[in-house]
């Protein structure tokens, strides 16, 4: 990713999405009514164009939010500690990695438009997130839908760093 | 391209066991539920169960339940419904379907193109 | 388990007509997730709406969705010879999830 992010970052991901699919505690089929839209900016992460400081920079804002979402009291009520001390440590070590690559991508005088703007269109994003979590007072159905949409927006996120991944690797070969 | 391929028709004899299959491409098979529809001669549409192929739990229509089995295995991104003993009504044509699971999405945006199963002595 | 009535069961309409279709459901679906499909003879259902107004990418213009609560409308703006077929709506609220009995929309 023209940084020296290493490449267990796409497997740290993986992990990420792993966890969060082992963290459910209920069906979800008994959750449908609580089903929202929360807007996920998909134009953010769809993208043929994509410079490397707007994907860290998504990357580096999704699993800051995650992180702040699942490192709540709210959060330690709702899941099995083990499983989310597992994915705090994981998210920790994510955020350290892109932490240093943004510095660098900065440091090649990438645009601060490209970090800063996608920032805020996540914040938005999961002040919705919250929101809603407090609207359905923490129910547990509202914590299942949240981490199923949370599995989508993580999904397309990393599909994002993927597709850059690969455009490097065929700029390298070519 | 999103697919979702069901297995030929099926003349069968009351009594007998069957399963039908429904293979999903284009797609995270994982990320999407499975929905099974009958659909019996002349009638409408009657949902009948639908599973999360990432864990295979699954959910049943109260008119299903212990009638048909779904299954999955995400290995191979297939879905089954079987029946361990057919009755001549269990005649139809049966569909699946994709669901986005709680996921703010469209219901059954792709469906197979189905599965006549008849059964007759 | 919520029940979905339609209607009417079967209506006659001529090409250009607009046509409307209503769905009740016994209970209130109160994040208005309620589908709607076509239906053509030998092929599967095709979603035309979701979430009670949203159109499903690909579906021409002329299909709109409305309602909210325990009343829903699918409207054919200007009916077309392809839009001769079978409406089906369809709750996706809660489980069982559950369709209407159907209405089949034919040639005047």
């Known amino acids: 990713l023209g940084c020296d992010l290493p490449q267990n970052h796409g497997l740290l991901s993986r992990n990420t999405l792993v966890l969060l699919h082992q963290m459910r505690r209920i069906s979800p089929f008994l959750c449908l009514k609580d089903r929202r839209d929360f807007r996920f900016p998909q134009e953010m992460v769809k993208g043929s164009q994509l410079q490397k400081a707007h994907v860290m920079s998504v990357l580096h804002e999704m699993l800051q939010q995650i992180f702040s979402l699942f490192h709540t009291e709210r959060s330690s009520a709702a899941w099995n500690m083990t499983l989310l001390d597992q994915l705090h440590t994981g998210l920790h070590q994510q955020l350290q990695h892109l932490e240093t690559c943004l510095l660098q991508v900065v440091g090649e005088g990438e645009s601060a438009g490209a970090i800063s703007s996608p920032a805020l269109t996540l914040r938005r994003y999961f002040q919705g997130i919250r929101v809603y979590l407090k609207e359905k007072k923490y129910s547990d159905c509202a914590w299942e839908v949240v981490r199923m949409e949370i599995m989508k927006s993580l999904f397309l996120s990393t599909n994002m760093q993927e597709r850059l991944r690969s455009k490097d690797r065929d700029l390298g070969s070519s | 391209e999103v697919q979702l391929v069901q297995s030929g028709a099926e003349v069968k004899k009351p009594g007998e066991s069957l399963k039908i299959s429904c293979k999903g491409s284009?797609?995270?098979?994982?990320?999407?539920?499975i929905g099974w529809v009958r659909q019996m001669p002349g009638k409408g549409l009657e949902w009948m169960g639908i599973i999360d192929p990432s864990d295979s739990d699954t959910a049943y229509s109260p008119s299903f339940q212990g009638q048909v089995t779904i299954s999955a295995d995400k290995s191979i991104s297939t879905a089954y419904l079987q029946w361990s003993s057919l009755k001549a009504s269990d005649t139809a044509m049966y569909y699946c379907?994709?669901?986005?699971?709680?996921?703010?999405?469209?219901?059954?945006?792709?469906w197979g193109q189905g599965t006549l199963v008849t059964v007759s002595s | 388990d919520i029940q979905m009535t339609q209607s009417p069961s079967s209506l006659s309409a001529s090409v250009g007509d607009r046509v409307t279709i209503t769905c009740r459901a016994s209970?209130?679906?109160?994040?208005?997730?309620l589908n709607w499909y076509q239906q053509k003879p030998g092929k599967a259902p095709k979603l035309l709406i979701y979430?009670?107004?949203s159109l499903q990418s690909g579906v021409p213009s002329r299909f709109s969705g409305s309602g909210s609560g325990t009343d829903f409308t699918l409207t054919i703006s200007s009916l077309q010879p392809e839009d001769f077929a079978t409406y089906y709506c369809q709750q996706g609220y809660d489980t069982p999830l559950t369709f209407g009995q159907g209405t089949k929309v034919e040639i005047k």
């Open positions: 284009g797609y995270s098979f994982t990320s999407y539920w």
């Open positions: 209970q209130s679906i109160r994040n208005n997730y």
């Open positions: 379907a994709r669901h986005p699971g709680l996921n703010w999405a469209p219901d059954f945006d792709y």
């Open positions: 979430a009670a107004s």
